[in-house]
């Protein structure tokens, strides 16, 4: 989508919503190429805020603060034009994050979908947030934005997402913001990691020794399928973490990951995924559930010799 | 319930300093923006500027840029206006409003009286 | 800047009359966002100003419904449907789409 005839396309990298502190590069691309250009800040004076600074391929705006957010246009250079200069660009809005409280997001369902479902991310704040704002991590279009709605003194807004493919997989988070100053945002939401399931085919889980237990005695899930995941995901029923290890190749060719669950104390129903580095957030088929039992005195808990993983950082690359 | 009470009245001459408080209670201060607000002898309102409580960023009209200076003190839920150098035009009342959201100015201080005088 | 003109400068009204007080914009008061944030304050004799309308007609809380809002673009009106004595004091429009924001120079109700 580059600039028609004599328009430049103006893009920001890696994305239109910077933090505060943070730095952005505007690139104006113009007949099929990055020219000199000129860039224009639209506000209340209409002239550039780079007043006679010429720039090429890219301009690498920061540390950014909130005089920054706005709308922006660059010019590329027409050298044998009257004015020497091409029409404006298209508009490009930057917003600035951390201008106020975070608010928060939560997936409903939840965050674990199956391909094809439709999450509603919802995005809240005790702050009265006139807009919130939705982005996905990586993405540099324009995040989405809703109006928000106010009750009983909270603000928000819900984001219907789907039908899932693997493209909406990723980490999102939400911002807020008011009418004082639209393109300051707030402080980004904690991030949420949308996860999609059923794109492969399910590894197989079992319980070493074995599904049956007694009380204090240890217990090793292990996860393994002939397809060469490079992650493996342990989730149980009824707790919002979810482990996960390196998937080792084995000598018959599988790939597999052993969970120490530490001494039995506790039983559970538990189903594994496998993913790959390149598609974090995509996940295969559920396992078969496995039912671990536990005979004698359980107790309320399981303790992990394993910590559980955030409930955010799954969509990152274990490294 | 909410409220927002600031300083008593200021008898002050030219070329001096004065600091007016505004102390924000029966709210999350840092949620909402607040807003400065003069009113001269007998005039109608005016709209000063405001600062962001959460990042302590002010921004002023242009007609207050220069003399005044919004700050905060977060942990005392309060915000401050300092006018420096005072001069006999800024004999006024002076209101602190909270905003955010929908509403510019939904609760308001009582107003503080300066009288500027030689 | 944007100049808010109200009219009229002074309104005497009977109590239990219909007050009506128009306020026009320089500009349209259309904010990026789409919202039009208009806003209507009473100011009795010696108080701060109190906050009755905004967004043009959304009635702020404990303002009773005797007050209405309504208009867009650059012109804008506040209704009293019935005058009762605490609604006399000074009326202000003010707007909050364009930096700087501003107020209205007032409507003074008061009892014919």
């Known amino acids: 989508l580059m600039g028609g005839q004599d328009k430049p396309f103006l893009s920001a990298r890696p994305s239109t919503v910077v933090p505060r502190g943070g730095h952005v590069a505007l690139q104006c691309h113009y007949r099929r190429g990055f020219n000199n250009f000129m860039l224009y800040k639209e506000d209340r004076s209409h002239v550039p805020i780079f007043h006679g600074r010429i720039f090429q391929e890219s301009f690498i705006m920061g540390p950014v603060t909130p005089a920054h957010a706005g709308t922006y246009r660059c010019r590329g250079s027409r050298p044998h034009s009257l004015t020497g200069w091409s029409a404006p660009s298209n508009p490009l809005v930057i917003m600035v994050t951390g201008n106020h409280r975070k608010p928060s997001l939560l997936a409903h369902p939840g965050p674990l979908l199956k391909s094809g479902e439709t999450v509603i991310l919802q995005c809240w704040s005790d702050v009265m947030f006139e807009h919130f704002f939705l982005h996905r991590e990586g993405i540099s279009e324009d995040p989405s934005r809703l109006v928000g709605q106010i009750h009983d003194g909270v603000s928000k807004a819900n984001f219907s997402i789907g039908p899932l493919m693997p493209v909406l997989a990723g980490t999102y988070r939400c911002y807020g913001s008011v009418p004082h100053s639209p393109y300051q945002l707030s402080a980004p939401s904690d991030p949420l990691d949308i996860v999609i399931t059923g794109l492969y085919e399910k590894p197989s889980l079992s319980a070493q020794p074995g599904p049956t237990v007694q009380a204090g005695e240890n217990v090793t899930l292990s996860c393994s399928s002939w397809s060469s995941y490079d992650i493996y995901h342990l989730s149980r029923e009824g707790e919002a973490h979810e482990r996960r290890l390196r998937a080792v190749p084995k000598v018959n060719r599988t790939f597999q990951a052993d969970f120490p669950l530490g001494p039995a104390t506790h039983g559970g129903t538990y189903r594994c995924f496998g993913s790959f580095r390149a598609l974090p957030c995509v996940w295969s088929n559920s396992s078969d559930p496995l039912l671990v039992s536990v005979t004698g005195n359980p107790s309320s808990s399981w303790p992990s010799p394993t910590e559980p993983s955030s409930k955010s950082g799954i969509c990152r690359h274990l490294h | 319930q909410i409220q927002l009470v600031q300083s008593g009245p200021e008898l002050k001459k030219p070329g001096e300093t004065v600091k007016i408080s505004c102390k924000a209670s029966g709210y999350t201060f840092t949620n909402y923006g607040m807003n400065w607000v003069k009113q001269a002898p007998g005039k109608g309102l005016k709209w000063m500027g405001w600062?962001?409580?959460?990042?302590?960023?002010?921004t002023y009209a242009d007609d207050f840029k220069g003399r005044f200076a919004f700050s905060l003190e977060t942990s005392a839920t309060t915000a401050y206006l300092q006018i420096n150098n005072l001069k006999n035009e800024d004999m006024a009342t002076y209101f602190c409003s909270r905003s955010f959201g929908s509403t510019y100015g939904d609760y308001w201080g009582q107003g503080t009286t300066l009288t500027v005088s030689s | 800047d944007v100049l808010m003109t109200q009219t009229p400068l002074s309104l005497p009204v009977s109590l239990g009359d219909q007050a009506s007080i128009s306020c026009r914009s320089s500009?349209?008061?259309?904010?990026?966002?789409?919202?039009?944030?208009l806003e209507w304050y009473l100011q009795k004799p010696g108080q701060s100003p109190k906050l009755l309308i905004y967004?043009?007609?959304n009635r702020f809380s404990g303002v009773p419904d005797r007050f209405s809002g309504s208009g867009s673009g650059t012109d804008f009106t506040l209704k009293i449907s019935r005058v009762e004595a605490e609604d006399l004091g000074v009326y202000y429009c003010f707007q909050g789409s364009h930096v700087p924001w501003t107020f209205g120079g007032g409507t003074k109700l008061e009892i014919k």
């Open positions: 600062i962001n409580t959460y990042t302590g960023e002010p």
């Open positions: 500009q349209t008061i259309v904010h990026s966002n789409g919202n039009t944030y």
């Open positions: 967004k043009v007609s």
